[in-house]
Interface confidence: low
């Protein structure tokens, strides 16, 4: 019968020829005139057999990622008789893997959105690299992910590529971060190859800022001839949040005279001071009222940021009008 071990040839061998192994019939005692032949795809071009000994050589550099095995056929003929000594047999030459492919991130560019102030451990996104090397061959395609840029705000799970938040972030300080992830094969051991990808992580706004008046004191004037409903001036607060999180409502906190009202212009987010009752210079020529401002939408879990609404004082001077 045929005698051989399993045949392996390392890929990317630079030598002009590489000995793979030997095909032999157990009837070959060294005295026979046995001729070994190699047939099939690659025979005579990629692989050469020493027909006298059955030694097989690879004469071309092989790339496992292009082709991982070759199925060939072996024959042994007794030259003396011209007859086959053994039945023709099929055998396999496997191309063994070397770590010649770096991990590649195929789904880039990566982009993720995560709410600001998300707690530590919040999942942001999973990045996945693939490695064309053989996953069953040692650690050539076993990847470890690490963070090249993004500390201390982000971390990556070494085996999954899951990016998580490791420190709370405030959108009002920085609204986007570039995280660079490296995937290293060979589980990071010497000889490892690596690939990197960038992840743009954008922070979405949460209502973690209350509106605050721009001024602690506003001075307005109103003519005593002004009818009720007259807009006598505007007050303004600012809110570092954006969108609906910056929508605000103004209201009167103190007005003993109950002479004024404040309505909110939801387009400009200004407070408009309105005359609720007519004023009389001769009766009272100035007023002091206090206004407050609050956000329109505040989820329960964010109320801690909204204790003690911002207030401002408004001094209103009544202008005298000559009366007949």
């Amino acid at each position: 019968g045929w005698v051989w071990n399993q045949f392996f040839v390392p890929e990317e061998m630079n030598t002009t020829s590489h000995h793979i192994g030997q095909l032999r019939s157990d009837l070959d005692n060294g005295n026979n005139s046995f001729q070994y032949k190699l047939l099939g795809a690659g025979a005579g071009s990629t692989f050469i057999i020493d027909e006298r000994t059955g030694d097989i050589y690879a004469i071309q550099k092989l790339d496992r990622e292009e082709r991982s095995l070759y199925i060939l056929r072996a024959q042994v003929i007794d030259i003396a008789t011209g007859r086959a000594v053994e039945p023709e047999s099929e055998f396999v030459i496997k191309v063994s893997d070397i770590n010649d492919n770096e991990p590649k991130f195929l789904d880039e560019p990566y982009e993720a959105i995560v709410p600001e102030m998300s707690p530590e451990g919040t999942l942001v996104i999973q990045v996945t690299a693939s490695d064309a090397d053989d996953p069953s061959s040692g650690n050539n395609a076993r990847l470890l992910y690490s963070l090249l840029q993004g500390q201390p705000y982000f971390s990556v799970e070494p085996t999954t590529g899951v990016i998580r938040i490791s420190s709370k972030m405030d959108r009002e300080l920085q609204d986007e971060y570039w995280v660079i992830i490296q995937a290293k094969d060979m589980i990071g051991q010497p000889g490892a190859l690596s690939g990197t990808t960038s992840v743009l992580i954008k922070l979405s706004d949460v209502n973690d800022n209350k509106p605050i008046f721009k001024e602690s004191l506003y001075r307005l004037t109103v003519s005593e001839s002004a009818p009720t409903g007259t807009s006598i001036g505007t007050i303004m607060a600012y809110d570092n949040d954006i969108g609906e999180n910056a929508e605000m409502d103004y209201s009167i906190e103190e007005d003993d005279s109950q002479t004024f009202d404040i309505i909110t212009n939801h387009e400009t987010q200004e407070g408009i001071v309105i005359l609720k009752k007519k004023v009389d210079f001769e009766h009272q020529n100035h007023y002091g009222i206090r206004a407050k401002v609050k956000n329109h939408h505040v989820p329960e879990q964010l109320m801690k940021y909204h204790t003690e609404a911002s207030t401002t004082f408004i001094k209103i001077q009544v202008e005298d009008v000559d009366e007949p």
Epitope: P109, L148, Q149, W178, I180, T196, T197, S198, L200
Partner: antibody, heavy 122, light 108 residues
């Protein structure tokens, strides 16, 4: 404002190694990507490769076997080495900066050096 | 590699006219990561447009960029004498970064 200045020999012999340095002034080399680009006389532009300040590199596959780009953050410099040069490597060599800050992704080149002419001749 | 083909090779126009320069990519440019540069003799290229349509700092608004996928255009709405130069497009959506061969804009 940030300025780039290339320096190095203007004449290199065939088969030798071309070595150029780009000095960054008016700003830090940190947190940006820095590229080398060349332009043969009367021809278009060819990207050679980049280096990030941490030392990671990416090279044009057409030149990869001959190119090494390195960085010296302490001197605010990065360098190009191109081995086994031939006359085809005669060109105006520019250093340039990606306009993206802390980006792993490429961006356009917003700042360029004035270029240094390198002739390969014996 | 992504190959960028610019047309026309040379464009002869007079000051005040409108210039339209084309850049076609051999495959789609990811994220419209395409830039335009102007280069005058003896000078380094100057960034005009990035992201296909965003003007760089200090670039006059007569320069505008448009396009996506494989077809991109640089338009100069009203040519000034200082606009006559060579214009290059560049893609940076995929490594290696590549440039077009250039369009020479000359005065008629």
């Amino acid at each position: 404002q940030v300025q780039l200045q290339e320096s190095g020999p203007g004449l290199v012999k065939p088969s030798e190694t071309l070595s150029l340095t780009c000095t960054v002034s008016g700003g830090s080399i940190n947190s940006y990507y820095w590229s080398w680009i060349r332009q043969p006389p009367g021809k278009g532009l060819e990207w050679i490769g980049y280096i990030y300040y941490i030392g990671s590199t990416n090279y044009n596959p057409s030149l990869k076997s001959r190119v090494t780009i390195s960085v010296d953050t302490s001197k605010n410099q990065f360098s190009l080495k191109l081995s086994s040069v031939t006359a085809a490597d005669t060109a105006l060599y520019y250093c340039a900066r990606d306009s993206r800050y802390r980006s792993g992704w490429y961006d356009a080149f917003d700042i360029w050096g004035q270029g240094t002419m390198v002739t390969v001749s014996s | 590699d992504i190959v960028l083909t610019q047309s026309p090779g040379t464009l002869s126009l007079s000051p005040g006219e409108r210039a339209t320069l084309s850049c076609r990519a051999s495959q789609s440019v990811a994220g419209s990561y395409l830039a335009w540069y102007q280069q005058k003799p003896g000078q380094a290229p100057r960034l005009l447009i990035s992201g296909a349509s965003s003007r760089a700092t200090g670039i006059p608004d007569r320069f505008s960029g448009s396009g996506s996928g494989t077809d991109f255009t640089l338009t100069i709405s009203r040519l000034e004498p200082e606009d006559f130069a060579v214009y290059y497009c560049q893609q940076y959506g995929k490594s290696p970064i590549t440039f077009g061969q250039g369009t020479r804009l000359e005065m008629k």
